[in-house]
């Protein structure tokens, strides 16, 4: 029951996280004009990964896409790549985890297969979350670096060279959405990995091994895991998991765990 809950919760948390990563990637407010000592501005600039926007006091908002690919900063391209990789991995992870959910029965799928799928999706969610966090952090670092470099700059306009103070940009809402979403995806992935441990029957690792000593009929069973696994000399023929899960190893190994000596 706890395994199902952990897996289900992991899935839901990851789903919210990936939705957040997608939202953050699409949002225009990755960086917003720093208003410092001027909270009300007639022209407000903000930028996303795909376009930059200007909102006037009049209420008119104009957005322009970055129609160049080569002309964009390498860091911005890197952030785009990280976010897209995060979304793709997350989406595949979601797809895999749907089939891995213990509460969903698909044909005669073994619990061992579900455990493997849960682990796979968990790892995908972790990598997806890390990609998003990395992408947002790289962008944030870029903003911090540029913030103090935004001194007087020269622009060539219709009237020739004109002295103008460059607009300073600070953290936009998308950064916080990205950080939170990446964190949620990461947490969801960890939960899926934890759920996987519960789904995979551990007894494969602790199979009884028969040693036939000469002249004696004695069975030796290693008891080194007694404290951690609950295995003892009296646990013979007793199932550890109610789900009756069997790993592929177990199916293939000739003497099963119910091997009487």
């Amino acid at each position: 029951m706890a395994v199902t809950a952990c897996q289900g919760l992991g899935f839901v948390v990851s789903l919210i996280g990936i939705a957040g990563i997608i939202a953050a990637t699409c949002m225009d407010q990755w960086s917003t004009q720093d208003l410092y000592n001027n909270p009300v501005t007639a022209v407000f600039n903000y930028q996303g990964l795909w376009r930059s926007c200007v909102r006037e006091s009049s209420g008119f908002t104009e957005c322009r896409g970055y129609f160049t690919l080569l002309g964009l900063p390498a860091m911005l391209q890197a952030v785009r790549a990280l976010m897209i990789v995060g979304i793709v991995l997350g989406a595949i992870g979601l797809l895999v985890s749907i089939f891995a959910l213990k509460c969903i029965r698909i044909g005669s799928m073994e619990d061992s297969a579900k455990a493997n799928m849960t682990l796979t999706s968990g790892i995908m969610f972790i990598v997806s979350g890390l990609c998003a966090i990395a992408g947002v952090s790289v962008f944030a670092n870029m903003l911090v670096t540029n913030f103090w470099m935004s001194t007087a700059n020269m622009y060539t306009g219709m009237g020739g060279m004109v002295q103008t103070v460059q607009t300073r940009y600070t953290f936009g809402a998308a950064l916080f959405v990205g950080w939170v979403a990446g964190g949620l995806t990461l947490i969801g992935g960890v939960m899926m990995c934890i759920a996987c441990r519960g789904l995979a029957p551990e007894e494969t690792n602790y199979k009884a091994v028969s040693y036939h000593a000469s002249g004696h009929s004695v069975a030796y069973k290693p008891g080194g895991f007694k404290a951690s696994t609950g295995f003892g000399s009296n646990t013979k023929n007793k199932k550890i998991y109610d789900g009756g899960a069997r790993t592929e190893d177990e199916v293939q190994s000739y003497p099963s765990k119910h091997d009487y000596v």
Epitope: N38, N45, S52, S58, G59, F60
Partner: antibody, heavy 118, light 113 residues
């Protein structure tokens, strides 16, 4: 086509409060734009006073901020200007206007002349 | 506050001739976000409210004759009337539309020579 019409007393005594109202017709004051007050002293240039949004948020010219209050009444499709402690320097034609693209003013009222005199 | 300085204070031009009015701002009105200059031009005739002619320094308002054109960037701007008509006699104002408080130039009175 949006139309604006200012109304209010044409004569105000010094130290009193000037009160003007702008009635918007041909459009809703709740349309999302900012509604402005601008004045023009006789024979002089234009001076921006401030604006209000239908939500009640305001922004005033720092030179007048301590004396200005702009309010809105969405039910009557009106917004108002109150200027306290007036002096002869506040004698002007007061215009209400609506902002548009480029933070420009394509819509203006006809203006109302306010004279500050005892 | 951004100070807007217009020149000349008054201008007399013959009908059909070119009229040029200059406006200088104390700070740049150029916005790098959309590559636009936030300068507006108005025409005001006696007893009337100002009429919007040009916004974003060079975008003509609908219904404004094409003899009116705006140019310039950053801090220096120009309003040009290519062929002066009798109805163009008025006072012309430039406006800082880039930052609060919005400020206007002192005006240029255009007359017929």
């Amino acid at each position: 086509q949006v139309q604006l019409q200012e109304s209010g007393p044409g004569l105000v005594k010094p130290s009193q409060t000037l009160s003007l109202t702008c009635t918007v017709s041909g459009g809703s004051i709740s349309s999302g734009y900012n509604w402005h007050w601008i004045r023009q002293p006789p024979g002089k240039g234009l001076e921006w006073i401030g604006y209000i949004h239908y939500t009640g948020s305001t922004n005033y010219n720092p030179a007048l901020r301590s004396r200005v209050t702009i309010s809105v009444d969405t039910s009557k499709n009106q917004f108002s200007l109150k200027l306290s402690s007036v002096t002869a320097a506040d004698t002007a034609v007061y215009y209400c206007a609506r902002i548009y693209n480029g933070n420009s003013f394509p819509y203006w009222g006809q203006g109302t002349t306010v004279t500050v005199s005892s | 506050d951004i100070v807007m300085t217009q020149s000349p204070d008054s201008l007399a031009v013959s009908l059909g001739e070119r009229a040029t009015i200059n406006c200088k701002s104390s700070q740049s009105l150029f916005n790098s976000g959309n590559q636009k200059n936030y300068l507006t031009w108005y025409q005001q005739k006696p007893g009337q409210p100002p009429k919007l002619l040009i916004y974003w320094a060079s975008t003509r308002e609908s219904g404004v004759p094409d003899r009116f054109s705006g140019s310039g960037s950053g801090t220096d701007f120009t309003l040009t009337i290519s062929s002066l008509q009798a109805e163009d006699v008025a006072v012309y104002y430039c406006q800082n539309a880039y930052s609060f408080p919005y400020t206007f130039g002192g005006g240029t009175k255009l007359e017929i020579k």
